[in-house]
């Protein structure tokens, strides 16, 4: 009996035309939502003039439906038992699941001022930038709509720069009508224990963002894992959102719509400094902001963002060192709300429910040459927003799962 079930599972989780796995893999049957909370800055003038702590107040959720588009350019390679694809990006605003509209205004860090002053270091260039910031009436902070902040707007200061610079900025710009990949993953035909594991991303086995093992593309994309998952396993996966591979460990047994699943969570150790977790030494890319690699809980992904000083963390700086959150008032981290988890059905390896939580922050530094940053007396890693991307298997699919998979075993 068990052998027959194993054989059936092995057959059905292969990523090829005709299997249950393939149908759900090409286009997810689960509705996936991405909720945003924006950190509205309450005291912009005090920060700019006196280098005060930044007082933030989160506003949200603002909810978008995402991951509703089918994978594109799906191509099987029989020779190396892989399947390659592009994952198209799309987001549809859901007013009924949101506290306001895409036209709501927020006071946030001026993305262009923070990024340009960080990247363009030449003394003469900084003088030009300063005059253009003043000319465009730009400042350290700005008021932007949700739509502008997320999806992009033409920046008035960058538009005056007399060089071919990027003049449109936004935290997720460009997004709609773009795609992530090309991913090339093992289809499991020759070896089921490799199914869904990424072979290459954008044609390479490494990212070129990090040194040593930190640069590796490990595991799957977290939508599924090879079947027969054990509680003792460390599940590796790659997330292009955070420009790195990461891992999850077993936390607890959960009953999801009558289906026994394993809850795997991202442990605090994954965000620790190299002092506590030596494996993380290669995620420390510079010495000053990281206080000689002793800070933890923030990841500098600037190399992955064309040099823009983007730092990824967990929401509200959960699992981050006190020095990171000290200059920010109004944060309340808690595990239940702000950690990431995956609920995995162990027989198939399918992720039936997940909550992926992350925060996007931008570094802003004092600058002698740039007037609006002149009074700053310290560096700030400024929270802009945090997001919660969730998906749960639908009732119909859960019934099918219970009858065809878990029901047959129990």
């Amino acid at each position: 009996g068990d052998l027959l079930i194993q054989k059936t599972i092995k057959k059905q989780v292969v990523l090829e035309e005709g299997t249950i796995a393939f149908k759900n893999w090409v286009k997810t049957g689960t509705e996936v939502y991405r909720q945003f909370w924006i950190f509205d800055v309450q005291n912009p003038q005090e920060v700019m003039m006196n280098s005060s702590n930044i007082q933030v107040k989160q506003r949200g959720p603002y909810t978008y439906r995402v991951r509703f588009l089918a994978k594109e350019n799906v191509t099987q390679d029989a020779e190396d038992n892989t399947v390659s694809f592009l994952q198209p990006n799309g987001a549809i605003f859901e007013p009924s699941l949101s506290v306001g509209t895409e036209a709501d205004n927020f006071t946030v860090l001026n993305l262009a001022v923070a990024a340009a002053s960080h990247i363009y270091q030449n003394q003469f260039v900084q003088m030009i930038l300063n005059s253009l910031i003043n000319k465009s009436k730009s400042s350290m902070f700005q008021v932007r709509t949700l739509r502008e902040l997320l999806w992009g707007y033409r920046d008035p200061f960058l538009s005056l720069v007399p060089y071919p610079v990027t003049t449109t900025v936004g935290l997720f710009y460009p997004y709609n009508n773009t795609a992530d990949g090309v991913y090339k993953v093992f289809n499991g035909k020759d070896n089921i224990s490799k199914v869904a594991i990424i072979d290459t991303y954008k044609g390479k086995r490494n990212l070129s963002y990090w040194e040593s093992h930190c640069d590796m593309i490990n595991g799957t994309d977290a939508a599924s894992f090879p079947p027969f998952v054990e509680k003792s396993q460390v599940l590796q996966f790659f997330s292009s959102d955070i420009c790195r591979s990461i891992y999850a460990v077993f936390e607890s047994d959960v009953n999801l719509k009558g289906i026994p699943v394993y809850r795997f969570v991202l442990p605090s150790k994954a965000f620790a400094s190299p002092v506590e977790n030596p494996d993380n030494y290669c995620f420390c890319t510079e010495k000053i902001i990281s206080k000689n690699c002793t800070s933890y809980g923030v990841l500098d992904i600037s190399k992955c963002k064309e040099g823009r000083p983007v730092y990824i963390s967990l929401p509200h700086f959960l699992y981050a060192s006190p020095d990171v959150s000290e200059p920010i008032d109004g944060l309340n981290p808690n595990e239940e709300e702000h950690r990431t988890y995956l609920d995995i059905e162990p027989i198939t390896g399918f992720t039936l429910q997940f909550a992926k939580r992350l925060q996007v922050n931008l570094l802003v530094k004092p600058s002698e040459k740039i007037q609006v940053l002149k009074n700053l007396k310290r560096n700030y890693i400024v929270p802009i927003l945090w997001l919660n991307e969730t998906g749960t298997i639908g009732d119909e699919k859960a019934n099918m799962f219970r009858s065809q998979v878990t029901g047959k075993i129990n």
Partner: nanobody, 120 residues
């Protein structure tokens, strides 16, 4: 590859003149802002004069205004610094710099420097 070659430095008496030249190769000269910096022993490198790629608003540090003049000849891929009424405090190594911006990148190139000594 990119090269910036300074020339024209030397020893000059106070009140004298020198004309520094910097000839560029390996990049599109007309797309770059060109600057002259100087560094005196034990001091930080200082921006002396700069001219944008289009020859627009020229910058001079206060201490050289009215004495130094920067110009560029895009046909010859060369930037000049005419230095008049030289003072002992102008003694330094003078460096040529080329910079442009493209996308989110800054392309910043430096010459090896030429020594200017103002002494009687």
């Amino acid at each position: 590859q990119v090269q910036l070659q300074e020339s024209g430095g030397g020893l000059v008496q106070p009140g004298g003149s020198l004309r520094l030249s910097c000839t560029a190769s390996g990049f599109t000269f007309s797309s770059y802002a060109m600057s002259w910096y100087r560094q005196a022993p034990g001091k930080e490198r200082e921006l002396v004069a700069a001219i944008p790629h289009d020859g627009g608003s020229i910058y001079y540090v206060d201490s050289v205004k009215g004495r130094f003049s920067i110009s560029r000849d895009n046909a010859k891929n060369t930037v000049y610094l005419q230095m008049n009424s030289l003072k002992p405090e102008d003694t330094a190594v003078y460096y040529c710099n080329a910079v442009t911006l493209q996308g989110w990148r800054e392309y910043d190139y430096w010459g090896q420097g030429t020594q200017v000594t103002v002494s009687s």
